[in-house]
């Protein structure tokens, strides 16, 4: 069964730096990855980055760098410039468009009492949507 996993990590050395890691588990090839925050893409979420395996990546502030980790996983580095640390309570969502499976999405966030370097579990009920 296709599945999307999401991790949110806080840098141990720089508490203003966060990284969102996400990946697609399942057959098929990835045609597009969209990372958003504040909710799922197209459902109240704001795009942070779009990654295409051949056309490259595009990102929007506060995203700093979007990169492929493997052919089915990506990482997105974020710079939290605000003193109030808005990332701490934010939901990050990753949507993978895959052929022939369709689109699958899951969300995760950093726990409120997160230690530096800690990864967040996915939200209790990931949004797994096959379009």
């Amino acid at each position: 069964t296709p599945e999307v996993w999401v991790q949110v990590q806080m840098e141990a050395t720089e508490l203003s730096s966060f990284t969102v890691h996400c990946g697609f588990l399942g057959p098929g090839s990835i045609s597009l990855v969209t990372v958003s925050w504040g909710g799922p893409d197209g459902a109240g979420g704001t795009k942070l980055a779009v990654l295409h395996p051949e056309l490259g990546t595009r990102q929007w502030a506060p995203a700093r760098q979007a990169r492929w980790e493997t052919q089915s996983s990506i990482s997105l580095a974020l710079e939290d410039s605000g003193a109030s640390s808005p990332f701490a309570n934010t939901t990050f969502c990753c949507k993978f468009a895959s052929f022939p499976e369709g689109s699958w999405e899951s969300c995760g966030s950093l726990p409120p009492s997160s230690d530096p370097g800690l990864s967040a579990p996915p939200t209790p009920v990931p949004i797994l949507r096959a379009d």
């Epitope: 599945e3 996993w5 991790q7 990590q9 890691h21 996400c22 990946g23 588990l25 760098q65 990169r67 492929w68 980790e69 493997t70 052919q71 089915s72 996983s73 990506i74 990482s75 370097g117 800690l118 990864s119 967040a120 579990p121 996915p122």
Partner: antibody
């Protein structure tokens, strides 16, 4: 088929540096991460670091100050360099492929046995 | 670093038995748990990733389960070729860490 081959010295003098090359075949480094792990009787399995397909690296904080991982994608090679080795760095050093981003290492090199001794 | 504990360092079982190997983590790792097999003088072999996903080519008698801080690897019908040492490993937070291993032997 997927293969990871390793080359490097078996014996290293204390305070000297270690260089190991992992040459892969059967897949491209443009789609996979390569981890480095070492294993010794005293310390068990220790993850050293990874270089992802995009070139970004992550290191175990315990080794970050003396560890460097790089690659030459065109030659299908990944390089581990570790400085200032001591006796307790004696171990088997292995490279291992990551296809999911989950640090799940699905194919491993044979390992390079490194002894630090004068 | 996150601690991985395999409380049973060695385990004896008979061929055909159902064998369960346990792994406990020092904090919730949200299913980011992998299992490996290692035979003497050989490299590690990935069996299970993300708690329960079977790696390609691994026999279906191997299965993984668990959540939170408690995870297990089950071999449903032990065969001679399964005699090896089994390691759990978390990929939840840096650095990824391994358990100390459980050596499986024939009774």
């Amino acid at each position: 088929q997927v293969q990871l081959k390793q080359s490097g010295p078996g014996l290293v003098q204390p305070s000297q540096n270690l260089s190991i090359t992992c040459t892969v075949s059967g897949f491209s480094l443009t789609g996979y991460g390569i981890n480095w792990v070492r294993q010794s009787p005293g310390k068990g399995l220790e993850w050293l670091g990874v270089i992802w397909s995009g070139g970004n690296t992550e290191y175990n904080a315990a080794f970050r100050s003396r560890l460097s991982i790089s690659k030459d994608t065109s030659k299908s090679q990944v390089f581990l360099k570790m400085n200032s080795l001591q006796a307790d760095d004696t171990a088997i050093y292995s490279c291992a492929r990551d296809s999911t981003g989950l640090y799940a290492m699905d194919y491993w090199g044979p390992g390079t046995s490194v002894t630090v001794s004068s | 670093d996150l601690q991985m504990t395999q409380t049973t360092s060695s385990l004896s079982a008979s061929l055909g038995d159902r064998v369960t190997i346990s792994c406990r983590t020092s904090q919730d790792i949200s299913n980011f748990l992998n299992w490996y097999q290692q035979k003497p003088d050989g490299p590690l072999k990935l069996l299970i990733y993300y708690t329960s996903r079977l790696h390609s080519g691994v026999p279906s008698r191997f299965s993984g389960s668990g959540s939170g801080t408690d995870y297990s690897l089950t071999i449903s019908n032990l065969e001679q070729e399964d005699i090896a040492t089994y390691f759990c490993q978390q990929g939840y937070m840096l650095p990824p860490t391994f358990g100390g291993g459980t050596k499986l032997e024939i009774k």
